[in-house]
């Protein structure tokens, strides 16, 4: 039969070469002389000349040692031809399998492997995987089967078997409890890879295991107690910086401190923030403290971390004794703005009101008073009692100083502290109207024709308030009623002046008496220019000859 079973040839053969492997034989050689040849990679194509065949005998020859790691199998074709070159057989498939020798050591894929694991993890936790390769065969032989092992561990704390490596997968795992970043932040393992499944050649590499931080350390106050002095009334005042130590990784959430006032701040007077760089707790006043109400506060502050604790840890507490310093506080007028009703025009020396201040300080400080702003100079204030009296005539109708019936005065109180402090109060005098102004006509100069004169309408004004105003009454005096009439309109707020007899062109005084609803009378002289004209006129026509 023109068939050859697969041929196995060990790699790295010693020879001698050429080495006979197998004989090709066609049964057609009984009839005719047969010539044998081979083709294929390793014969007539690259790598050429590895194999040859004795042309007449059919012996398959190996010309040099084989390398399985280069070519593990050769597929050749055997040919049989007669003397005339005619093919006597179909090409025959020749498989040459190169069998493995353990001629390669394992090689790690990296010189140094890096991995990490959280501190405090349980045994069995996977850390990392290392890999070594071996070019030898690992399917049919153990030549390329790599077994992994840990040769050494540095440091050997808390003991020298903190990790294990899976002998076939290269997975490094934690085998013992006690990984503590704060004691050992990094382990260096010398790892081995050995072929022949652990019985052959060995190579080494390094695995560096970084121990990652977990929040397994509570921040601790150092010191745990503080004494501070704070001025009363100060807001945003730094009271104290609280210092903590934390063994966890700096600037990590497990290290960054969070402060909480646990007790002693009943009035919510204090606040505490974390300094972003130093991690200190900055205790400041959120509201002003009151020495007179409470001169000492004892605060209790607890510290934790931004990250939660990974195990139950006792929290550290600090005590801060805050002495509140007495500050000489300004007297405060009660009320800060005082409204007092007073009649205008009260006699000089008449009391207006008593306006006093209270001193928040507990010592019996003496308070003295004075007027700070009195635009019209109408008032005086007793420095000891705070009694305000009239020293000028209070005039409601004084438009320069009085707005909407109110006269505004600013007063000052000063204590005898060291240094002295002052407080101000506003006194708003609501001036009650008295009927101290009579009605006044407007305008007080008129021009009128002596023939068919037009009635002159004069507006009546009274600076007083109702009921000391309209309805008004009008009366002509000093014989003015011989030539003139004066009548108040129905609304009672204007007076109509009429010329009832002919007067020659000239200027005349009309004596008009107006009285208000409270019978306050005001005599006004109206200057009347009479012109030689008819009806309405604004100025006299023609040359003026009046005297």
């Amino acid at each position: 039969d023109w068939v050859v079973a697969p041929i196995s040839v060990p790699e790295n053969g010693k020879g001698p070469f050429p080495q006979r492997l197998n004989q090709l034989k066609s049964n057609k050689d009984r009839d005719t002389k047969i010539f044998y040849s081979i083709t294929g990679p390793g014969a007539d194509s690259p790598p050429e000349g590895v194999f040859a065949v004795e042309k007449e005998t059919g012996w398959l020859l190996l010309n040099k040692p084989l390398d399985r790691e280069e070519i593990a199998k050769y597929e050749l074709f055997g040919h049989a031809v007669s003397e005339n070159g005619a093919s006597v057989e179909d090409p025959m498939n020749i498989s040459i399998i190169v069998t493995d020798q353990n001629d390669h050591k394992p090689k790690f894929t990296q010189d140094t492997f890096r991995g990490s694991v959280l501190e405090g993890v349980l045994p069995g936790t996977s850390v990392m995987q290392v890999t070594a390769t071996d070019e030898d065969d690992a399917i049919y032989t153990y030549n390329g089967v790599v077994a992994y092992s840990i040769h050494s561990q540095e440091p050997k704390d808390p003991h020298d078997l903190m990790f294990t490596i899976h002998r076939s997968t290269g997975t490094i795992s934690v085998i013992s409890s006690g990984l503590d970043r704060e004691k050992v932040p990094e382990y260096t393992l010398t790892i081995q890879a050995t072929d022949m499944d652990g019985d052959g050649s060995t190579t080494t590499a390094v695995a560096v295991v970084e121990i990652l931080d977990a929040n397994d350390n509570a921040p601790m106050f150092d010191p745990q107690k503080y004494e501070a002095h704070v001025p009363e009334n100060a807001v945003g005042h730094e009271v104290q910086r609280l210092t903590v130590t934390d063994l966890d990784a700096p600037n990590s959430p497990a290290w960054r401190a969070t402060y909480l006032i646990m007790g002693g701040d009943d009035g919510d007077h204090f606040t505490i923030t974390t300094h972003p760089e130093s991690n200190q707790g900055i205790l400041t006043t959120r509201k002003g403290l009151d020495f007179e109400a409470k001169n000492q506060h004892t605060l209790y502050v607890e510290v934790t971390n931004e990250a939660p604790f990974v195990l139950k840890l006792p929290t550290s507490t600090a005590t801060i004794v805050v002495h509140v310093e007495d500050v000489n506080e300004a007297p405060v007028f009660v009320p800060p703005s005082k409204v007092v009703e007073v009649q205008e025009g009260i006699p000089t020396g008449e009391p207006v009101c008593v306006y006093t201040a209270e001193d928040p300080d507990k010592e019996n400080q003496k308070i003295s008073y004075r007027i700070l702003r009195d635009p019209a100079g109408w008032l005086a204030m007793d420095p000891d009692s705070g009694q305000v009296t009239a020293v000028g005539t209070l005039d409601r109708e004084d438009e320069q100083f009085v707005r909407n019936n109110i006269y505004e005065v600013m007063v000052l109180a000063m204590d005898n502290g060291s240094p002295p402090t002052t407080g101000t109060g506003t006194l708003l005098l609501t001036l009650i109207d008295v009927n101290d102004h009579g009605p006044v006509p407007e305008p007080r100069q008129i021009t009128i024709c002596n023939q068919s004169p037009v009635r002159q309408v004069l507006n009546i004004t009274d600076k007083d308030l109702s009921p000391h105003t309209s309805p008004f009454q009008a009366q002509l005096t000093d014989d003015s009623d011989i030539y003139w009439t004066a009548e108040v309109n129905e609304e009672g707020d204007t007076v109509v002046l009429s010329l009832k007899k002919f007067l020659k062109q000239d200027t005349y005084d009309v004596h008009l008496s107006l009285s208000d609803h409270g019978n306050k009378e005001q005599l006004t002289v109206i200057r009347a220019t009479v012109c030689d004209c008819h009806g309405h006129v604004e100025t006299c026509p023609g040359p003026w000859k009046g005297g």
């Epitope: 010191p223 107690k225 004494e227 501070a228 002095h229 910086r241 210092t243 200190q280 310093e325």
Partner: antibody, heavy 118, light 103 residues
Framework: QVQLQQPGAELVKPGTSVKLSCKSS????????IHWVKQRPGHGLEWIGE????????YYNQNFKGKATLTIDKSSSTAYMQLNSLTSEDSAVFYC???????????WGQGTLVTVSA | QIVLTQSPAIMSSSPGEKVTMSCSAT?????MYWYQQKPGSSPKPWIF???NLASGVPTRFSGSGSGTSYSLTISSMEAEDAATYYC?????????FGGGTKL
């Protein structure tokens, strides 16, 4: 008025220890902390530590841990500082002080001159 | 710890002159405190919280500064002001003093 009284001087031998006193009067002794300050001749001031008379809580400057020990006797309103293993470096004036207005060391004792000499 | 450096270490002045001495901190502090000491006497509180004069301190003295740089100024030197002045910080432990400026 507030007073802190200290003895004027102490002469001690090297290797021994000395206990300095600071007697307070004129205020409630347990309400304010007592501080201790060292001043070597021609040198500046060094804060040693502090003690709260209300509960004997102490806090030391690291440079003086093991060297100084602060204690209190409430019954006599007296603060004490013991200095151990004395050497010539410990020859100095030691002041006690009390904090007050403005966080200042407002009240100071007159100081005790400690001379360490064989 | 925070180190306070005072400069100059020694200075002299005539009556009526303006005097300024400085205190530099290795890291930021909120307030600075100053003491005056004369030979044979205990230190006296002089300036608190950077700029406030302690009781009985003449108004010719003033204090200023922030962060890491502070100073004490005498507007018009008088003979009684001759002394050593120490700066101190309070809020961060350990409480430290500067080396002093001898005026």
């Amino acid at each position: 008025q507030v007073q802190l009284q200290q003895p004027g001087a102490e002469l001690v031998k090297p290797g021994t220890s000395v206990k300095l006193s600071c007697k307070s009067s004129g205020y409630t002794f347990t309400s304010y902390w007592i501080h201790w300050v060292k001043q070597r001749p021609g040198h500046g001031l060094e804060w040693i530590g502090e003690i709260d008379p209300s509960d004997n809580y102490t806090y030391y400057n690291q440079n003086f841990k093991g060297k100084a020990t602060l204690t209190i006797d409430k019954s006599s309103s007296t603060a004490y500082m013991q200095l151990n293993s004395l050497t010539s470096e410990d020859s100095a004036v030691f002041y006690c002080a009390r904090s007050g207005y403005g966080n200042l060391f407002v009240y100071w004792g007159q100081g005790t001159l400690v001379t360490v000499s064989a | 710890q925070i180190v306070l450096t005072q400069s100059p270490a020694i200075m002299s002045s005539s009556p009526g002159e303006k005097v300024t001495m400085s205190c530099s901190a290795t890291s930021s502090v909120t307030y600075m405190y100053w003491y005056q000491q004369k030979p044979g006497s205990s230190p006296k509180p002089w300036i608190f919280r950077t700029s406030n004069l302690a009781s009985g301190v003449p108004t010719r003295f003033s204090g200023s500064g922030s962060g890491t740089s502070y100073s004490l100024t005498i507007s018009s030197m008088e003979a009684e002001d001759a002394a050593t002045y120490y700066c101190q910080h309070y809020h961060i432990y350990p409480r430290t003093f500067g080396g002093g400026t001898k005026l």
